[in-house]
Structures are given as C-alpha cells and as structure tokens.
C-alpha cells in the first residue's frame, strides 16, 4: 500500500498515570493515541505483553476502544501478584509506533493482623499512660487513630498526644479508664485492633497518719492509720522495720494498732504501710514507754575491815534509763557514774551504778544513799557501811553445794539445792533471770537449808536460777538452768553426798609469780568416789567481794592459776567433779600474795627521777592503834610524780629495852597506796614512824616522824 499524504505515525496524547488500587477493586490505566490510520493499542507489563479479553474472553482485563486498559477486579495474593507492576501502552500503525510513559500499578493492601496490638495498662492517677499500637502491614502505610469506648478520641486535648502509633495521656484521671481500640486505616479500609483496657488506679494516701506517743508502762496505746486508694490498699504494721511480734498487738477493722498494756519492750518506731497495685506509702510514729525507776539490785548493809575495798551494788532499770548517783548521808557531795575521780578520792561509781570505796577508813562508816532519777519518777535505797578492825577480815561465803542443771516435766516438782557456810553465817536468796524470786508465787518456797522448791511446774518456769549466799563479808552466787518440758522427769534427782567425790585436801602453794600461783592438792579421802576433774575458785578482797571460778576441767592435782593481779593477796579452794556433780570445797589455802610488778625497763633519766622524788612531800597522819600489836599508818602526798614505785614505812622502838633500835621497813608497793598496817608490834611500847617514797634504788625525802604508843590491852570501844 502506498503512503497517503494525510497519514501520520502514532502519537500518544494521553499517557497512563500511576495508580494505587485496592485488591478486588476495578481500575483503569488510560492511554489515548492519535495517528492515521488509527493505531492499534497493546499493553506491556514489566516488558511482557498483557493478556486481555481480546486474547481470552474470561480474562479480568479488558482493552477499551479508547485504548485504555480496564481491570474488572485487581487480582493480588500473598505471593502471586499478576496485576502489580510497571505498565506501558504501545500505539502502532504502518508508519511506526509510539510508547507511553511508564505507569506503575500498585495494589493497596491492609492486612488484618496488627503488628502490635495494644495491651492492657494499669497506671496510678496522675501518671502518664502509654498505649502502643503497630497497625497491620499495608500499602500505602496505614495511619492510625484511637477510639475509647468505641468513640474516636480527639487528640486536640492537651493531655493527649498520638505519635508514631503511641497514644500518650500525660496526666491520667479516673475518667480516662476504659476500653481503647487502635484503628489502622488506608484506602483499603479500616482495621480495629483487639481492645485494651486502661485501668486508672489511685495510689494509697493517708487520711490519718499515726502520731508519736509517750505513755507510762502498763497504759494502753493506739496508733491510728486511715488510708484511701483504688484498689483499696492493704494495710500492715511493722515495728522497727520488722514484722510485729505475735500476741501483743490487736489490729482493729479500721487498721488501728492497739497495745492493751504497754511494756518497755514495746518502745520503738511503728510503721503503717499501705500498699496497692500502683503504690506503697509508709507513715511512722514513735512509741516511748516511760517506766518509773526500779531496783534490779539494791545495795545491802556491809561490814568491812579497814584498808579493804567495798562495793555497794545499785542496779536500776526504767525508761528512760535512770540517772544514778550516790551520797553519804550527811554529806552534800554527790557521786555520779563516769565522773573523773578526784585526786584524793577513794570513791567511784561504775557506769552501772555500783559505788566502790577503796582503802576503807573508819571515817567511811555510815549510811550511803543510792538515788535513781528519771522523768517518770525517782527512788532511793540506803545501805550501812560498818568499818571493823583489820583482824576481822573474812572471805565471802562459800557455797558448799549449789543447784544442778536439770530437765523436768510439766506439773513436776523442782528442788534447787543451795547449802552455804561462812563467818558470819550467810543468808540465802534466789534470783530467776537476774530478778528476785520467788516473789508472791505460792508454788515456790525457800526451805530451811536454802533449797528452792517449785511445785506444779509450768513451761514458763524454764530459766536460769541463781542462789546468792550473802553476808557482811561478801556474797557468792551459783547458777543452774531449769528446763521444763512435756517429757522431763517429774522430780529432781536428789544426789546423795555419797554419789559425789570427796573434797580435795587443802591446796598448797608451790610457786608464785606476779600473775600466777601454782597449787597442788590431794584427791578426797580414800573410800570416797574418785574425781574426773577439778575446779579452782579464788578470792581476793581487792578484786571482788565474791569467790570466782578461775579454772575448770583441771585433770591433774597440780595446776598453775594464771591471769592474776600483781601484788594482790588471794585465797584458793578446790572442788572435785564427777558425772553426778561437784564435791564440797577443799579447805581454803593460806593467803598468798602475788609478786610485785618488776621495775620499769631501764633507760629512765636518773636525774629526772631524783629531781621528781625530791619534790614529793609526804604528810604523815597520826598513827592509829588498832590492837595492842597493830598500828595503822596513813599519809597523803602533795603531788604524785611519774616516778614512784611505792612508799617505805619505817618504824623503830623508842622506849623499852630496845629503844632507838635500827629502823624496820614495811614497803607499800603500790604507788597509789596511802595506808599500811604495822603488825607484830610489842604491847605498851612507843614507836617512831616515818614514810619515804622510792623508785628502784632512788629514794625521796622522809616525811616528818610521828610517835605512837601501843596499848597493853585491846582498846575499849
């Protein structure tokens, strides 16, 4: 065919446009071409010819007369995507062809399943709440909005913001609680997430907090604690950061904590803890239980020899802890614990309130008053101190047989033995857990020999029982544990003395050092039961006013007692042990004095020592005749220098056959000593006495001399 003049090649006059269309929806890709003769139109997708109804009448794609490609419904699966791609239309006639611009057909998609469904959220009112949502996969990428209780949320409210799938409520209120749904939307449609519940709880708050309280012992007390919150908070109490001990406390329906009868042990910080799912609040208050002062140990009258040391116990309790002080009746001078000791004072009060007087003088005799004072009241107790001659110096009581540990049954009878001896004869009393016993309990009696009997035993009778043998010369105690159980024996096994080993012989001193004494003894007399071991007891007036156990489980009959004080007089006793118990004590050893502390290390400045000794001024008091053959010498020192080891008391006869005989010496080897007793003097004789300080071989200035005449007979009272 010949080219006609009016013919012209195809030209695309309407190009197809990019399109996004939902799966299953119809769509059209437009294409219009001009040319003569009229061009034929074909479509290509991704370079491959597109089949239309012209090829297969069943095809879902139709080629329209205009040249446009019409899709009856877009076909698009999870994997097969036959309609998606890049399309061009091609217009052809015999003069040539024209190709349109590319047009992409994308299938809009909105899956059903949310990538992230919002989850239930629980917040406390006032806190921010965040609900998170990731919409289903989709094309175009879905946007989201939120519904609360099926109503769309207006995010114009300043507390609410929606950013990147997150719904944020900055300051939640109770009214924000409800069911929230995230809606994902694009051109395909909308998808609702699973609903999520926002629960707005309220943290616990106190309507009424407990307040600090101060009560007297045995009074009732209540701590109130009123709370609110949602959910209703649980309320519990703690004491001093620990759970409340059982049995002493009532907690009422309104969470008030009540103590019917307060005790000092109830004192502390009580904390009310209110807790719910969203918070925990604590409020605390202190309870102070005032207890008036009471005596735990009262001072007792004591008879003490001159030169010895006495201790008056005065132990008190109360809340607050009582302030204890002492005074001698008739004196304005008050003595307090922890008070720096005055240079010449022989009195001191221990932190627990015990009054100690050293180097007893006749002038110390009298009544001593212990007073205990608190804001809850005051108490006082008097004790008499009698001062006797040195010769009446006696050891404290000896407990021959003390109580034994035992386990007894409920409703059984306990017999706790305590047999004591001494001069003067001691009085026996009992303590349970350190407190006077038996009090008013009719089940308990102290029998004639001192044995404590407790009938109809109860579990509460379990405890440590102490027998105390007391006399003017001191006190001795012996403790045993009574354990009352459902399955124990019904009555104490009363050991016969024949079950026990015999007492050992009097201990002999075989060696003495400054800190130790070596003793030897013989076992009990033949015919008595053998000992499996021994215990050694010691007494020293300057250490305490009671016998002390200084060695246990001694397997031999020769033993060195260590840890003793230098230059101190001790008495010793030995007891034998077998499985049934302890023997009576051996006779007392002779008094033994430990050696004095050796002089300080060499390297002392001799000139300094001599200078200081030369400055010491010793003032000798008038000597006191104690008996026809004993005289007490006392002195004072103006200043106590660093270098003094002791004082040399020098005395000689100035009448009678040996007048102006040579000086005899008695060394007071303790630098703090201010008295000495001269013994074995002659009756009715005048003696000259003077005192000289010394340090090693260096000697200070003698005091002025004093004279004294011993009597022919014992001085009258």
């Amino acid at each position: 065919s010949r080219l006609r003049q009016e013919d012209f090649p195809p030209r695309i006059v309407e190009h197809p446009s990019d399109v996004i269309v939902s799966k299953g929806e119809p769509t059209t890709l437009n294409c219009k071409a001009e040319g003569r003769p009229t061009p034929t139109i074909e479509w290509y997708k991704d370079g491959e010819r597109v089949e239309t109804d012209k090829d297969d009448p069943r095809s879902h794609r139709m080629l329209l007369p205009s040249g446009s490609l019409f899709f009856l419904r877009i076909v698009h699966g999870r994997r097969s995507k036959p309609d998606e791609g890049s399309y061009v239309c091609v217009a052809r006639n015999y003069l040539g062809e024209a190709v349109s611009r590319n047009a992409s057909l994308e299938v809009a998609l909105l899956r059903d399943d949310f990538r992230q469904n919002p989850t239930d959220v629980v917040v406390a009112a006032g806190e921010p709440a965040i609900l998170e949502c990731q919409p289903p996969r989709g094309h175009p990428e879905p946007t989201i909005y939120w519904k609360k209780d099926k109503v769309r949320i207006d995010d114009k409210e300043e507390r609410i913001s929606i950013r990147g799938g997150k719904l944020m409520i900055s300051n939640t209120r109770k009214s924000d609680a409800g069911m929230y749904t995230c809606v994902g939307t694009n051109m395909v449609g909308e998808r609702d997430s699973d609903p999520a519940e926002l629960t707005v709880f309220e943290r616990p708050t106190f309507l009424r907090r407990p307040i600090n309280q101060v009560v007297l012992e045995e009074e009732a007390v209540e701590f109130r604690c009123q709370v609110q919150g949602d959910p209703q908070p649980t309320v519990r109490w703690k004491k001093d950061d620990a759970d409340l001990p059982r049995g002493r406390y009532d907690i009422k329906d309104d969470y008030t904590l009540r103590i019917k009868k307060t005790m000092s042990t109830d004192e502390g910080t009580y904390m009310c803890i209110a807790e719910n799912r969203v918070g925990k609040m604590e409020a605390s208050a202190t309870l102070t239980v005032r207890a008036p002062p009471q005596f735990v140990v009262r001072p007792r009258d004591q008879i003490v020899a001159q030169g010895r040391t006495v201790t008056f116990p005065c132990e008190t309790k109360g809340n607050p802890q009582p302030a204890v002080f002492w005074q001698k009746e008739g004196s304005q001078n008050l003595l307090f614990p922890n008070q720096p000791q005055q240079p010449n004072s022989r009195c001191s009060v221990s932190p627990t309130g015990d009054l100690t007087i050293t180097n007893i003088q006749r002038s110390d005799a009298g009544y001593y008053i212990c007073q205990a004072l608190t804001v809850a009241g005051s108490i006082l107790a008097k004790a008499q101190l009698e001062v006797t001659d040195v010769l009446t110096d006696r050891p404290p009581p000896i407990i021959l047989q003390g109580p034994a540990n035992q386990t007894l049954a409920v409703d059984g009878t306990a017999l706790l033995k305590c047999k004591a001896t001494g001069d003067p004869l001691p009085v026996i009393s009992w303590l349970k857990e350190g407190f006077t016993f038996p009090g008013r309990d009719p089940r308990a009696t102290i029998q004639e020999q001192g044995t404590l009997q407790i009938k109809n035993l109860r579990i509460s009778d379990t405890g440590t029982y102490t027998c105390v043998a007391t006399s003017s010369s001191g006190e001795t105690s012996w403790s045993a544990v009574l354990d009352v159980t459902e399955s124990g024996a019904t009555i104490s096994k009363n050991y016969d003395l024949s079950d026990l080993p015999g007492p050992p012989s009097k201990p002999q001193v075989t060696d003495v050092t400054k800190n130790s004494v070596t003793l030897s003894w013989q076992p009990g007399t033949p015919g008595t039961l053998p000992a499996s071991a021994y215990i050694i007891e010691a007494f020293s007036q300057s250490v305490s006013n009671s016998w002390q156990t200084v060695a246990n489980h001694v397997k031999t009959t020769l033993y060195t007692v260590r840890g003793l004080r230098p230059n101190t007089i001790y008495l010793f006793m030995v007891r034998a042990i077998n499985p049934q118990g302890l023997s009576d004590p051996s006779p007392m050893s002779d008094p033994v004095r430990t050696q004095d502390i050796s002089p300080p290390a060499q390297g002392v400045d001799h000139r300094q020592v001599q200078k200081e000794l030369g400055d010491v001024l010793v003032r000798l008091h008038n000597p006191v005749v104690l008996t026809p053959t004993t005289v007490q010498v006392t002195w004072t020192v103006d200043r106590q220098p660093q270098f003094i080891q002791g004082y040399r008391v020098m005395y000689r006869q100035t009448s009678g056959l040996q007048a102006t005989s040579s000086w005899q010496n008695l060394d007071a080897k303790v630098p703090t000593e201010r008295s000495a007793v001269l013994v074995n003097l002659k009756k009715g004789v005048t003696y000259e006495i003077k005192v000289r300080p010394y340090f090693n071989e260096f000697q200070g200035m003698d005091s002025e001399s004093k004279t004294v005449r011993t009597t022919e007979e014992a001085p009258s009272a």
């Epitope: 991704d46 491959e48 297969d56 699966g77 994997r79 309609d83 059903d112």
Partner: antibody
Framework: EVQLVQSGAEVKKPGASVKVSCKAS????????MHWVRQAPGQGLEWMGW????????EFPQKFQGRVTMTRDTSISTAYMELSRLRSDDTAVYYC???????????WGQGTMVTVSS | DIVMTQSPSSLSASVGDRVTITCRAS??????LNWYQQKPGKAPKLLIY???SLQSGVPSRFSGSGSGTDFTLTISSLQPEDFATYYC???????FGGGTKVEIK
Amino acid sequence: EVQLVQSGAEVKKPGASVKVSCKASGYTFTGYYMHWVRQAPGQGLEWMGWINPKNGDTEFPQKFQGRVTMTRDTSISTAYMELSRLRSDDTAVYYCARESGDDAFDIWGQGTMVTVSS
Amino acid sequence: DIVMTQSPSSLSASVGDRVTITCRASQSISSYLNWYQQKPGKAPKLLIYAASSLQSGVPSRFSGSGSGTDFTLTISSLQPEDFATYYCQQSVGLFFGGGTKVEIK
C-alpha cells in the same frame, strides 16, 4: 484457555533423580507463583514447595530441603521440579499448580506418575 | 509449622443430604483457608478460597465459613457428582489437611 500440561510418567530406580516439567499457557507465566504437590497412592495431598517464575526464588518445607530443586524457563513458560536420591516412598503422582491472586491453587496440571522401583 | 486437622476422615451420605466437614488449624490463620475437591484419578479442583469465597464456576450448594482456627465446608444438598475426597489447605504455609472422603450411603 489457561492450562498447565505436565510431562509423562516415569519409572526410576532408588537413588536416581527424576525431573518433571510443567508448561503454562493462556496467562502471563511470570505473574503467578507455581507450586508442586504430590499424592502417594491412596494418600492425601502433600505440598512440596513453590517457585516465583519472575525471579526464580524458591521455598520448600523442611522435609524436602536438599533433595528437591525447582527451576523455570520463562522463554517457554515452563517450570521444572527435580527430586533426587529417590526412595520407594517417593512413588506418587506429582502435580504442578498455579497460585491465584486469591492465595489458592486455581489451575492444576494433569499429574505425572513417578514410580520408584528396583 | 501450622498443622491442619480435618474431620471426619470419611463419611457416608445420601443424595440430597446436608454434609458438613470441619478443619481445625493448630494456630490462627485468619481467613487464609481453601477447600478442594478431588475425584479418583483426577487433579484436585478449587471450590472455596479465603474461607468463604466461592470459586468461579463452582455450584452455590458449596459454602465455606469460619476464621481463626475453626473452619467448615458445607454441601447444602449432596448431588451424585459430589462424591469425592475434600481437602482443606491453609494458604499461609500451604499445608493440606488429611482429607475427608464422602461416600454414598
């Protein structure tokens, strides 16, 4: 007309390999995923995997990994399935099936009987 | 893998009966479930796609329902040509159920 035509029956010895072909016509071959399904005598249908003819991507269930190979030749609109190391329990009818845009197998081949016997 | 459990494995029915076959997925598959019919010596034929959509050319007596994990194929009035084996298939992982054979009573 849209159709899938498979190659003829095969008899193989254990340990050998078999390659079955599936020729598509009446539609754009690259627009639809091709799947292979087999059915042992008297048994149910067992899916063996797919190939995307557009790019040659494949996916197989764990059971067939390492033993099955799926390929295609777009120039002749044909898909192939090769099963190696044959065992007697591989005796089955092997079908190719087109996955429609509705995620279902709308067009199936007539099936190829593969017998594995020594 | 998502496991498809079909029940019953076989049933006997008469022409005109209403027949129900169930298919359960071991986990949710939304609506991605298809039903096929297979007659002896023939390739399977698609009946229902996307749980409830009827494939073009399939008689309306066939219907599908369900979503998530539980699905049903119902034949409202069984016809002689309906005696066959029916398979469900999940189109997420593409595995088939074990099949249900519908036989003449």
